[in-house]
Interface confidence: medium
């Protein structure tokens, strides 16, 4: 049926659009960039991204239409809605602060919440983190008693235990919570890298050709026999 199909008879796709046969008498146009509509008859007015503030653009009869996100208005959604123009958003004497696309209440002392509609209780919920205990010190003030290893006005900061570390023999201090660990070089072990690693036990074949392994602090040596020499009696 191809020769009698609308794609060939009426060439419906305009402005360089490509016609695709869907069935005996239906079709679909793939438009060139810059054109839109069932038959590519409209200029794509959305091509220039006219819609602002995250709004959605659609083209209708060569015109663009913007669907604004909440908090914006105008033909191009370019205007921020000033929610603070409408009284009553913030309760208990809260000050309304207009923001792009929204608003925020700055509450007077003693109130909290999005609309300043809740009474502020310093320790409910507790602002103290990392297991800190909240203690109310006044009508609107609190103090956090931190667990060992933490500090900060809300116990948010880990105390670095490394400044006074006792890692020996080139060990590197790694801070923990109210403690630290020593990352030891290969020749040393133990909590503070003070214990010598016995390489002769770890590597039974450290010395070649009948050489005897002798452990030493921070290393080992080979006692070679039968004319062999070198670090591992291989020469």
């Amino acid at each position: 049926y191809s020769t009698s199909h609308p794609c060939f008879v009426s060439r419906p796709c305009l402005n360089g659009g490509t016609c695709h046969m869907l069935s005996r008498d239906t079709y679909e146009c793939t438009c060139q960039v810059g054109f839109t509509g069932k038959e590519c008859q409209w200029t794509d007015a959305c091509l220039s991204h006219p819609c602002a503030n995250g709004s959605t653009c659609t083209t209708v009869a060569n015109q663009f239409s913007c669907k604004c996100l909440t908090g914006f208005t105008g033909q191009k959604c370019e205007t921020d809605v000033n929610e603070c123009d409408i009284p009553g958003h913030c309760q208990h004497g809260g000050t309304c602060l207009n923001l792009p696309g929204s608003y925020q209440c700055q509450c007077p002392q003693g109130f909290t919440g999005q609309y300043c509609d809740s009474l502020y209780v310093p320790c409910a919920p507790s602002p103290c983190v990392n297991g800190g205990t909240c203690r109310q010190t006044g009508d609107f003030t609190f103090e956090c008693n931190c667990l060992p290893g933490f500090e900060g006005s809300t116990c948010e900061r880990n105390i670095d235990d490394c400044p006074n570390h006792r890692c020996q023999n080139g060990g590197v201090c790694v801070d923990g919570v109210n403690t630290y660990n020593c990352r030891c070089p290969p020749q040393w072990t133990g909590q503070f890298c003070t214990e010598d690693v016995d390489e002769c036990l770890l590597q039974p074949n450290a010395c070649q050709n009948g050489g005897t392994c002798a452990n030493r602090n921070g290393g080992y040596g080979c006692v070679c026999v039968n004319g062999w020499s070198g670090d591992d009696c291989s020469e």
């Epitope: 602002p127 003030t141 103090e143 956090c144 500090e151 900060g152 006005s153 809300t154 948010e156 900061r157 880990n158 105390i159 670095d160 801070d175």
Partner: antibody, heavy 120, light 107 residues
Framework: EVQLVESGGGLVQPGGSLKLSCAVS????????MEWVRQASGKGLEWVAA??????????VYSASVKDRFTISRDDSKSTLYLQMNSLKTEDTAVYYC???????????WGQGTLVTVSS | DIQMTQSPSSVSASVGDRVTITCQTS??????LAWYQQKPGKSPKLLIY???RLQDGVPSRFSGSGSGTDYTLTISSLQPEDFATYYC?????????FGGGTKVEIK
């Protein structure tokens, strides 16, 4: 409204001294950790020193680059934070900001900054 | 000291673009991370604290995520007023350390 206003910056010769002030208002000064942060021209931010709050005995921490040369202090009666800078070096040239540590891993209020230039 | 590696150092973008900035720390900071915006001649402004919590008054197009040693700041739809330099900062332990900054420029 929380406000921090620094002052005391200026031109000083290497080896010289300068004392910066930061007057605060709009919050209970003694409840908060206070920090000094600096920024050399065209460079990033560098933490300098901190003074903990009253609950933590106003104890002090310094960065390695200023330890033994700079002293942070505060006067609660004047709601003012200070940074005494001695033995100044050319690499101390920067805008110095005082900031309030909000207690949630962020510095939530900053002053406008004061410029310190160390040059001969 | 905890090292902060921020990338990219600069990014060119257009209004409406989605912009992502990353920050990597040399050790686990347990979400103790903040993001700041700074415009030329101005002091830094706190955007995000605790890795993902939006500071009061900051538009919701800014968001933060991450844990452990890897953190991200996302601007979902870049606005003209967002062209600035952004810094990450760890507040998990002293000394406080900052990333090197990311300059967001107009394409």
């Amino acid at each position: 409204e929380v406000q921090l206003v620094e002052s005391g910056g200026g031109l000083v010769q290497p080896g010289g001294s300068l004392k910066l002030s930061c007057a605060v208002s709009g919050f209970t000064f003694s409840d908060f950790y206070m920090e000094w942060v600096r920024q050399a021209s065209g460079k990033g931010l560098e933490w300098v020193a901190a003074q903990r709050n009253k609950a933590n005995d106003f104890s002090i921490v310094y960065s390695a680059s200023v330890k033994d040369r700079f002293t942070i202090s505060r006067d609660d009666s004047k709601s003012t934070l200070y940074l005494q800078m001695n033995s100044l070096k050319t690499e101390d040239t920067a805008v110095y900001y005082c900031s309030r540590d909000g207690g949630r891993w962020g510095l939530d209020a900053w002053g406008q900054g004061t410029l310190v230039t160390v040059s001969s | 000291d905890i090292q902060m590696t921020q990338s990219p150092s600069s990014v060119s973008a257009s209004v409406g673009d989605r912009v992502t900035i990353t920050c990597q720390t040399s050790e686990d900071i347990y979400s103790g991370l903040a993001w700041y915006q700074q415009k030329p001649g101005k002091s830094p402004k706190l955007l995000i604290y605790g890795a993902s919590r939006l500071q009061d008054g900051v538009p919701s197009r800014f968001s933060g995520s991450g844990s452990g040693t890897d953190y991200t700041l996302t601007i979902s739809s870049l606005q003209p007023e967002d062209f600035a330099t952004y810094y990450c900062q760890q507040g998990f332990k002293y000394p406080l350390t900052f990333g090197g900054g990311t300059k967001v420029e107009i394409k």
